[in-house]
């Protein structure tokens, strides 16, 4: 189970913030109907990544990837899949 | 649906103390350079964002978690 499949819009926003690209951030925030104050708040987080440079973005991306692919998350994803299968079977 | 561990990480990034956030990161990646970077980013966010900003960021996260795209 790929991490982005569990909640693609979260990873779109996270990538846009960590990547430092305002155009991508705006586009992803549009898709969740973010308000102007919400956009301002997300841009402040984005500023921190930009100010701390490429290494900072890579390292934090590594953390997010590690958490998303950890047994805590993968176990959850597998459990959800099992539950879905049970429901589908019962549904028949 | 978003994984609870990811949700916890993001919540602590916004609302936790630097120590709480770094401790959470350490559970998954205990490299000194990673933990130092986590602390730098957390300190930066705390310095830049007002309480209202943090509430707005949490509001975005709520919208993300309840989105059909999640």
């Amino acid at each position: 189970v790929k991490m982005a499949e569990t909640c693609p819009i979260f990873y779109d926003v996270f990538f846009a913030v960590a990547n430092g690209n305002e155009l991508l951030l705006d586009l992803s925030l549009t898709k969740v109907n973010a308000t102007e104050p919400e956009r301002t708040a997300m841009k402040k987080i984005q500023d921190c990544y930009v100010e701390n440079g490429l290494i900072s973005r890579v390292l934090d991306g590594l953390v997010m990837t590690t958490i998303s692919s950890s047994k805590d998350c993968m176990g959850e994803a597998v459990q959800n899949t099992v539950e879905d299968l049970k429901l589908n079977t019962l549904g028949r | 649906e978003i994984c609870p561990a990811v949700k916890r990480d993001v919540d602590l990034f916004l609302t936790g103390t630097p120590d709480e956030y770094v401790e959470q990161v350490a559970q998954y990646k205990a490299l000194p350079v990673v933990l130092e970077n986590a602390r730098i980013l957390k300190n930066c966010v705390d310095a830049k964002m007002t309480e209202e900003d943090k509430e707005n960021a949490l509001s975005v996260l709520d919208k993300i978690y309840t989105s059909p795209l999640c």
């Epitope: 430092g20 690209n21 305002e22 155009l23 991508l24 705006d26 586009l27 925030l29 549009t30 956009r39 | -």
Partner: antibody
Framework: EVQLVESGGGLAQPGGSLRLSCAAS????????MTWVRQAPGKGLDWVSA????????FSADSVKGRFTISRDNSKNTLYLQMDSLRAEDTALYYC?????????????WGQGTLVTVSS | DIQLTQSPSFLSASVGDRVTITCWAS??????LAWYQQKPGKAPKLLIY???TLQSGVPSRFSGSGSGTEFTLTISSLQPEDFATYYC?????????FGPGTKVDIK
């Protein structure tokens, strides 16, 4: 009244360079992302490049990546397109356009265009 | 990149006709689609965004519909000033792309 006026087009040799400008007026320039769109003679519209309101972030079509650079000077209300390593297929009318707003980036105002011809 | 196709590419119609142009996206783009009108020698003009929202100042005879991968632009009663080329554009993801255009000509 919103106005966008392009300049800097002309004849260039293959491999040569040109710098296009777009002077903006009638709106708060530094509040809006901006875009360049081109149209080859008798052809359709081709999105080239966009830049965020602050000028910090850009995005370009693969066909121009590494050759064209979009930039802006918010103090001068001016958008630029630096075109290097020009090719014959870059021959087109180049339009600058304003994004409607950050949360729906359609192009609500366009300039009249400046013609770029690449030929030896 | 998301590809857009338009049908028809050329359309002959008379004043008063109801005209429909279709735009297909190569993948789902929700309602992130706009329509532009371009007359010869002029810059494009925004007609519709968000698939169905009419841009300020655009006559109500223009309407848009659709979501996902199929969209339509309808002109309820064609007027002499509507003879032009119409382009759809996706704004779901960068790079933004345009359809190839539909030329509406006088029959």
């Amino acid at each position: 009244e919103v106005q966008l006026v392009e300049s800097g087009g002309g004849l260039a040799q293959p491999g040569g360079s040109l710098r296009l400008s777009c002077a903006a007026s009638g709106f708060t320039f530094n509040n809006y992302a901006m875009t360049w769109v081109r149209q080859a003679p008798g052809k359709g519209l081709d999105w080239v490049s966009a830049i965020s309101d602050s000028g910090r972030s850009t995005f370009s079509a693969d066909s121009v990546k590494g050759r064209f650079t979009i930039s802006r000077d918010n103090s001068k209300n001016t958008l630029y397109l630096q075109m290097d390593s020009l090719r014959a297929e870059d021959t087109a009318l180049y339009y600058c356009a304003k994004h409607r707003n950050w949360n729906y980036p359609v192009f609500d105002y366009w300039g009249q265009g400046t013609l770029v011809t690449v030929s030896s | 990149d998301i590809q857009l196709t338009q049908s028809p590419s050329f359309l002959s119609a008379s004043v008063g006709d109801r005209v429909t142009i279709t735009c297909w996206a190569s993948q789902g783009i929700s309602s992130y689609l706009a329509w532009y009108q371009q007359k010869p020698g002029k810059a494009p003009k925004l007609l519709i965004y968000s698939a169905s929202t009419l841009q300020s100042g655009v006559p109500s005879r223009f309407s848009g519909s659709g979501s996902g991968t199929e969209f339509t632009l309808t002109i309820s009663s064609l007027q002499p000033e509507d003879f032009a080329t119409y382009y759809c554009q996706q704004l779901n993801s960068y790079p933004f792309t345009f359809g190839p255009g539909t030329k509406v000509d006088i029959k």
